[in-house]
């Protein structure tokens, strides 16, 4: 599967194997979380719609020194067609809402699981 049902995006949509790996990594993060993830760092909330991979990366890239999400950052960069650097700000961010990284990861995980199911069954 190289596209996911109901998901329009500027740039590449990850094939199901790559999406599955990203979901597995997010599952590992949520399951292995002992102390507050990334010391409770806050990131911009995003709209989980078209272009969300780049938006998610733009949010998470501003978190530094957090080894738990480094692999996620690398994986998201593979799904985003343009180079993302700290300080970038996408229209997909909910500008007045910041949430903890742990909540951001949970929200992203739920949405990606839904996209994965859509891709499997459509």
């Amino acid at each position: 599967l190289t596209c996911l049902g109901g998901f329009a995006s500027p740039g590449p949509v990850p094939p199901s194997t790559a999406l599955r790996e990203l979901i597995e990594e997010l599952v590992n993060i949520t399951q292995n979380q002992k102390a507050p993830l990334c010391n409770g760092s806050m990131v911009w909330s995003i709209n989980l719609t078209a272009g969300m991979y780049c938006a998610a990366l733009e949010s998470l890239i501003n978190v530094s020194g957090c080894s738990a999400i480094e692999k996620t950052q690398r994986m998201l960069s593979g799904f985003c067609p343009h180079k993302v650097s700290a300080g970038q700000f996408s229209s997909l961010h909910v500008r007045d809402t910041k949430i903890e990284v742990a909540q951001f990861v949970k929200d992203l995980l739920l949405h990606l699981k839904k996209l994965f199911r859509e891709g499997q069954f459509n």
């Epitope: 194997t17 699981k113 069954f121």
Partner: antibody, heavy 120, light 107 residues
Framework: EVQLVQSGAEVKKPGATVKISCKVS????????MHWVQQAPGKGLEWMGG????????ASNQKFKGRVTITADKSTDTAYMELSSLRSEDTAVYYC?????FGGGPFAYWGQGTLVTVSS | DIQMTQSPSSLSASVGDRVTITCKAS??????LSWFQQKPGKAPKSLIY???RLVDGVPSRFSGSGSGQDYTLTISSLQPEDFATYYC?????????FGGGTKVEIK
Amino acid sequence: EVQLVQSGAEVKKPGATVKISCKVSGYTFTDYEMHWVQQAPGKGLEWMGGIDPETGGTASNQKFKGRVTITADKSTDTAYMELSSLRSEDTAVYYCATGDYFGGGPFAYWGQGTLVTVSS
Amino acid sequence: DIQMTQSPSSLSASVGDRVTITCKASQDINSYLSWFQQKPGKAPKSLIYRANRLVDGVPSRFSGSGSGQDYTLTISSLQPEDFATYYCLQYDEFPYTFGGGTKVEIK
């Protein structure tokens, strides 16, 4: 506690259609895919097909040559499996099964099974 | 379709024995493999998912291992309640496919 409760045993004539229900509780119905599995008497397990209850998208086993229709009713948290053009070899127990693909696997929870007997 | 070849089809063992059941897939299934236990007249019960992850509530004497095409279910010390039929399942891609089953009987 996740529970899947299936409809009762059925006796059908060859050529008829059977529709089995699977009512779920204990989780959000649209969060997990739902699958159907056939087990003929004394035989192994065979995947028939599955559905994403959120979208209604389905996948099925070509072995059943389009005779299987899987649906989901979000308003009642119930999945259905319909098998048409029944023949004697369709005599089997049919199970629904569900689960989180990434946390327990898609067959973590099973219904109690529904025996369908096809006989003239 | 991915074929799942399970062996042995049956085995006889005694309480306390170490039991090993294998499943070989016809292609790499990326560790998307589950193991189930089924007793007569009952629905299958999930034991292991993702090849080696124990389902909550399942005794630790059950373990799964393997990768690529080759997978193993091990029961470290067989208990009286473990006499049953065991199935593997690949859920890497549709159509999902089960192994033929292994019946574990009392010696």
